[in-house]
Structures are given as C-alpha cells and as structure tokens.
C-alpha cells in the first residue's frame, strides 16, 4: 500500500565502523522525502532525519546508548510538499531494515601504530586506542573500553632487509617482541574479535618502520 507518487525505500543497509553507524537506502528521491525511525526490539520507535532528501541517516547517537542491544530501523516515504499524506491504509509507505547489533557487527576501523620503542633486543609496539562515540558517564570510551579482552591485536613484523614475516598477539594495546640487534624492523597491526563469526578483522594498519620518525631507539 502507499500513496500514489511515492515509492518504498529498498536496499536498506547498515554501514558501521567503530560504532559510527549510518543507515543507507535507495532510491534517490524524486518528488518524495524520507523519515527514519529506529527502535530496539522491545523499545519505542524514535524518529530521526525528518523529511530528508538524503538517502542516508546517521543513527550513531541512538545505537551508542547500548551497543549490545539489537536495533531495527524503518524508512518512511512521503510525497514532497505533502508529508501529511498517507497511503490507502492510513499509513505512509515504509520499509524495514535488517536487524543490527552494533557490538557484534560494527566493522573494526583500520588501527594505527602509535609508537614503538627499542630497548636492546626488545621492541615495545603500542597500538593507538581509538576513541569511539560510545559514552559512559559523559566520557567517550575507547575501542578497548568497549570491547575489553574481546579485542585482540595481531602484530606483523619483519626485518626491513627481508620479506619473512613473524607475528605476535596481544589482548592489550602493547606488544613486547624480541628483535635482532642492529636490524631495522617494519610493523603492521590488525584488530580481531575472535568471538565473532563475521566482521572479525580490521584492515591492516599502515606499515611503520624503524629508522623513521614514529619510534624511539635506545641501545642498552
């Protein structure tokens, strides 16, 4: 059902990275506008992005209230300039999104190596703990705050002079690895959430190499 001149939204898709969460849909509107509603399974509907001509709506503010909840969104279509108009059933045309559970489904953003420090034959590599838009007590939480030990980082490292890679893991944001004295190494990290079955991994961080600005070298 629905008003003549309006078409229902379709291809409703959640795009979410480190909890920044946007609902996208089609089609580009012609003589119509959209309003989005979001709800938890047991909660009330909340309207967002009122009468917009966009085909996306940022729902981050809603989902960060409880990232472990499962959310459902719907997109209403209204004729442009006549938003009071409803369909033959007395309802505006709408389409439901797939369910979305941020904690299980948000993509892990590309991590960044914050620093590395060599002390003798040990190197300490630190991964930046990215801030999310999830809040607790008026403070933005980091990725580590939200995921705790569920979040693992894998370090890849190799001698600048060789292609043979080694790897190590941590459930903190720091690695302490053994290296050969007098050799320069390159590093890259990947975030992983082992308990997930999909969206488990991030893309690899940019490569950082010793002998460049990021690190610090101390011969002991």
């Amino acid at each position: 059902s629905g008003t003549t001149n309006t078409v229902a939204a379709y291809n409703l898709t959640w795009k979410s990275t480190n909890f920044k969460t946007i609902l996208e849909w089609e089609p580009k509107p012609v003589n119509q506008v959209y309003t989005v509603q979001i709800s938890t399974k047991s909660g009330d509907w909340k309207s967002k992005c009122f009468y917009t001509t966009d085909t996306e709506c940022d729902l981050t503010d809603e989902i960060v209230k409880d990232v472990k909840q499962t959310y459902l969104a719907r997109v209403f279509s209204y004729p442009a300039g006549n938003v009071e108009s409803t369909g033959s059933a007395g309802e505006p045309l709408y389409e439901n999104s797939p369910e979305f559970t941020p904690y299980l489904e948000t993509n892990l953003g590309q991590p960044t190596i914050q620093s590395f420090e060599q002390v003798g034959t040990k190197v300490n590599v630190t991964v930046e703990d990215e801030r999310t838009l999830v809040r607790r007590n008026n403070t933005f939480l980091s990725l580590r705050d939200v995921f705790g030990k569920d979040l693992i980082y894998t370090l890849y490292y190799w001698k600048s002079s060789s292609s043979g890679k080694k790897t190590a893991k941590t459930n903190t944001n720091e690695f302490l690895i053994d290296v050969d004295k007098g050799e320069n190494y390159c590093f890259s990290v990947q975030a992983v959430i082992p308990s997930r079955t999909v969206n488990r991994k991030s893309t690899d961080s940019p490569v950082e190499c010793m002998g460049q600005e990021k690190g610090e070298f101390r011969e002991i």
């Epitope: 893991k169 079955t197 991994k201």
Partner: antibody, heavy 117, light 107 residues
C-alpha cells in the same frame, strides 16, 4: 556445519613437489586464517605457517620459507599448500586447520605425504 | 622461538582417577595457550583455548589453569574414552609451537 576436507594421500620421490588442498565450508572463509601443521613420529607436531584469506598475508615457520607456498582460491573457499624439493624427512601427515585467533578449532582429516624412491 | 615442554611424557591411570598434565613455556605467553586431544589416526581435537576456556562440546570433567609460563590440564575423573595423546600449543608468537605430547593410558 563447519568442515575442512583435505586431498588424498601422496607418494612422491625425493626432490619432487606436492600440493595439498583444504576445501572449507560452513563458515565465512575470509574471516578465519587457515593454518598448516605436520605430524611425524620423529618430530611430533610442527607448525608450518598460515595464510589470512582476508588480506592474503602469509606467515611461515623459518624452515619452510622457500620450501612451502601457501595459497587460496576464494571462489571455492579452498586453501593450498605446495611443498618443493621434498626430502625423506618431509614424510608426515599434513593438516590444515581453522584459526580462531585463540586456538585451532576445526581441523582437516589430514593428508599423508610419503617421500620414497 | 618459544619451547613448550610437557610432562610427564606418558601417564598410566585408573578409570575414575584424577589426572593432571602440565605444560611449561620457555618464556611468558600470558594465556595464549590451547590444549588438544588426539586419538590414533585422527586429527587433533580442541579441548581448551585461552588457557582456561572449555571448547564447545568438551565434557566438564576437563579443566585447565595457568598463565605466564606454567599451565596444566586436569581430568577430574578419567573415562575410557579419554585415552589419547594430549598436546599443548602456544599461540602467542610465531612459530606457534606445540609440546611433544602426553600419552595417557588406562592402568
């Protein structure tokens, strides 16, 4: 259900090459590394290396660098291990396994490779 | 490389007995340790991950403890089907080495 099914036994001559396949099903192939290990009475279980289907990255145990090559076919969710210049001491049962980062939770049935003249 | 040393190499125990096997890492690996059971002619089977967590479908008579260098696997009451070789593996840093195994037999 999750399965890793390996190719059949191989009898090869010293100096030859062999390719073992590991066809996976029942899970998202790109989300889990595929590990390779081998087992022999003389050396127990030895880790060979792994390949990450998400980014194609390979990590090898030092002794296998240059000897082994790990590869993938995304269209069939299959991992491959090729071993070159085989010696008698490469006689072993070779296993692939799915890596969940904290452990290897599903294993192939094993492929027996015998190097004999 | 991190060496994993299991002891004792072989154990003989009676049905219903409590059995403990140990695994020692040559350097600290936090809780990056897994335990496997392997029966003759079969693939290894995951028992424990992250040092203390029981894998899906593993009977509650199995438990594990440890962190750092020192780890142990305990069978609270030995069953006939527990006859197997048990392996520990560190998954902290490559190469991801295995112990040499503990062979468990019924006395």
């Amino acid at each position: 259900q999750i399965q890793l099914v390996q190719s059949g036994p191989e009898l090869v001559k010293p100096g030859a090459s062999v390719q073992v396949s590991c066809k996976t099903s029942g899970y998202s192939f790109t989300d889990y590394n595929v590990y390779w290990v081998r087992q022999s009475p003389a050396k127990g279980i030895e880790w060979i290396g792994y390949i990450d289907p998400y980014n194609g990255l390979t990590i090898y145990e030092q002794n296998f660098r240059g000897k082994g090559t790990l590869s993938l076919d995304h269209s069939t969710s299959t991992a491959y291990m090729e071993l070159n210049s085989l010696r008698y001491e490469d006689t072993a049962v070779y296993f692939c396994a799915r890596d969940v980062t904290t452990a290897l939770d599903f294993w192939g049935q094993g492929t027996s490779v015998t190097v004999s003249s | 490389d991190i060496q994993m040393t299991q002891s004792p190499a072989s154990i003989s125990a009676s049905i219903g007995e409590r059995v403990t096997i140990t695994c020692l890492a040559s350097q600290t690996i936090d809780t990056w340790l897994a335990w496997f059971l392997q029966k003759p002619g079969r693939s290894p089977n995951l028992l424990i991950y992250a040092a203390t967590n029981l894998a899906d479908g593993v009977p509650y008579r199995f438990s594990a403890s440890g962190s750092g260098n020192d780890f142990s696997l305990t069978i609270s009451s030995l069953n006939p089907e527990d006859v197997a070789t048990y392996y520990c593996q560190q998954v902290y840093s490559s190469p991801f080495t295995f112990g040499q195994g503990n062979k468990l037999e019924i006395r």
